[in-house]
């Protein structure tokens, strides 16, 4: 029998044909892949069918953030009987098929990662001709992106009662912690923000009142490294009189 | 069966240029990546350029050794690849071998006979 | 850049005895389990030919006395029972991060 499950948009989540217990659909997935920004990574994912020795024409495809509905981040197609599954889109053309669909495995290459890429991953995969059938992940992989820290802005802003402050932004993962030195300041840890809303890798620390002109360093760190960024404060002095 | 055939090697003087061709059959061309690799007499392989395909829209890549003087290029039309060779030096001299590689993997599954190039004064 | 080291760099062995050549990686080249390990055989006057794909994967045609181990920074390619025809220079090759990089060869020839 046929067991096919339908969201409220309409769209096939999946299809369970049950001949006997070893011949059913499944994916396997490891819950976590770890990587650095600027490196590659791996998303493994292998899955077993019901439908023996298919060689029909087949569609492998992930997508990002959520199953089913996503963003598809890459789509390769084999013809009937072809172990070439061709690339028909790659996002920014970071996404490789390392796997081979016919032998069961849809495992993807990612190429110069990016913080961004921090996102879950789903792999999918449709039969198509005589037998039509498709296939997701409900839970796919987490793509962990670390990064050393990278200081992003840094900038000095007037205050009222002409004052002024300093603001450091970073990014990094594991989030960096940001420490301002100064004069007459030492190391101070001042008014961290951290992290921003909606920018889970950005980190801001705030020198709420600069009194002493000279450099400002911020300097933000993580397991992975540190780095550091200065700016200068030179206020203007007149002549009394 | 596929086939790939490279041809424009020669005698060219230090600091001049020469352009190699490499004419593929028997498959696809526009599915794959395509490389040049080169060895140079009885010495090992060297990979010297990779440019990718329409999808991955035509990237190229290059070893260090011959970044800025060689340009890897292709025509999908003529089923070509190219390799145009400046400023170039004794050190390379080599045999330049066409090879293809599939788009998820960079290893070289079929290559050609390899054309000869030769730089001396 | 990925510096590959092969040994030995040529090897004697006797027709239908073991032949084993390693490979060493200055780094790591496996990815979640993925091996981005490559091996080539080269015959004098010829291009190269794939033999192994990512370590352990038979490339399309090739005999299956040849076999690839390993993962991380050591590999190996075997040839169970050396052939008068398997007398060559044999290369492993990554494509773990570019450039691409070759080891430096090993030749294999009959005792």
């Known amino acids: 029998f046929v067991r096919t499950k339908i969201d409220t948009t309409e769209n096939l989540l999946n299809t369970e044909v049950h001949s006997s217990p070893a011949q059913r659909w499944s994916m396997q997935v490891p819950p976590e892949v770890s990587a650095e920004a600027g490196d590659a990574a791996v998303l493994p994912c292998t899955f077993t069918h019901p439908h023996r020795h298919y060689d029909g024409p087949l569609t492998a495809i992930w997508r990002a953030g959520e199953p089913y509905a996503g963003p598809q981040v890459f789509r390769c197609a084999a013809a009937r009987g072809s172990e070439l599954c061709q690339t028909a889109l790659s996002l920014h053309g970071r996404f490789r098929l390392l796997g081979n669909p016919r032998r069961n495995d849809l495992s993807l290459r990612v190429e110069r990662l990016a913080l961004a890429d921090d996102r879950r991953y789903f792999c999918r995969v449709e039969f198509a001709g005589d037998v039509h059938d498709r296939y997701e992940s409900r839970h796919g992989v987490r793509l962990h992106v670390t990064a050393a820290p990278r200081i992003v802005n840094i900038s000095v802003l007037p205050s009222p009662a002409h004052a002024f402050r300093a603001l450091c932004t970073a990014e990094g993962e594991p989030p960096p912690a940001l420490a301002w030195s100064g004069p007459a300041l030492g190391n101070s840890l001042a008014a961290v923000r951290s992290p921003r809303e909606g920018h889970g890798h950005l980190v801001t620390a705030e020198l709420p009142a600069l009194t002493h002109d000279g450099r400002y360093t911020c300097t933000a760190a993580n397991s992975l490294g540190r780095s550091e960024a200065s700016v200068y404060l030179f206020r203007f002095h007149g002549a009394s009189g | 069966e596929v086939q790939l055939v490279e041809s424009g090697g020669g005698l060219v003087q230090p600091g001049g240029s020469l352009r190699l061709s490499c004419a593929a059959s028997?498959?696809?061309?526009?599915?794959?990546?395509m490389n040049w690799v080169r060895q140079a007499p009885g010495k090992g392989l060297e990979w010297v350029a990779q440019?990718?395909?329409?999808?991955?829209?035509?990237?190229?890549f290059y070893a260090a050794s011959v970044k800025g003087r060689f340009t890897i290029s292709r025509d999908n039309a003529k089923n070509s690849l190219y390799l145009q060779m400046n400023s170039l030096r004794a050190e390379d001299t080599a045999v330049y071998y066409c090879?293809?590689?599939?788009?998820?993997?960079?290893?070289?599954?079929?290559w050609g006979q390899g054309t000869l190039v030769t730089v001396s004064s | 850049d990925i510096v590959l080291t092969q040994s030995p760099d040529s090897l004697a062995v006797s027709l239908g005895e073991r032949a084993t050549i390693n490979c060493r990686a200055s780094?790591?080249?496996?990815?979640?389990?993925?091996?981005?390990i490559h091996w080539y055989q080269q015959k004098p006057g010829q291009p190269p030919k794939l033999l192994i794909y990512?370590?352990?994967n038979l490339a399309s045609g090739i005999p299956a006395r040849f076999s690839g181990s390993g993962s991380g920074t050591d590999f190996t390619l075997t040839i169970s029972s050396l052939q008068a025809e398997d007398v060559a220079t044999y290369y492993c090759?990554?494509?773990?991060?570019?450039?691409?990089?070759f080891g430096q060869g090993t030749k294999v020839e009959i005792k």
């Open positions: 090759q990554q494509s773990r991060k570019s450039p691409w990089t």
């Open positions: 090879a293809r590689s599939l788009t998820g993997g960079d290893y070289f599954d079929y």
């Open positions: 028997g498959f696809n061309f526009n599915d794959y990546f």
């Open positions: 780094q790591s080249v496996t990815i979640s389990g993925y091996s981005f």
């Open positions: 990512r370590a352990s």
């Open positions: 440019i990718r395909n329409k999808i991955y829209t035509y990237a190229t």
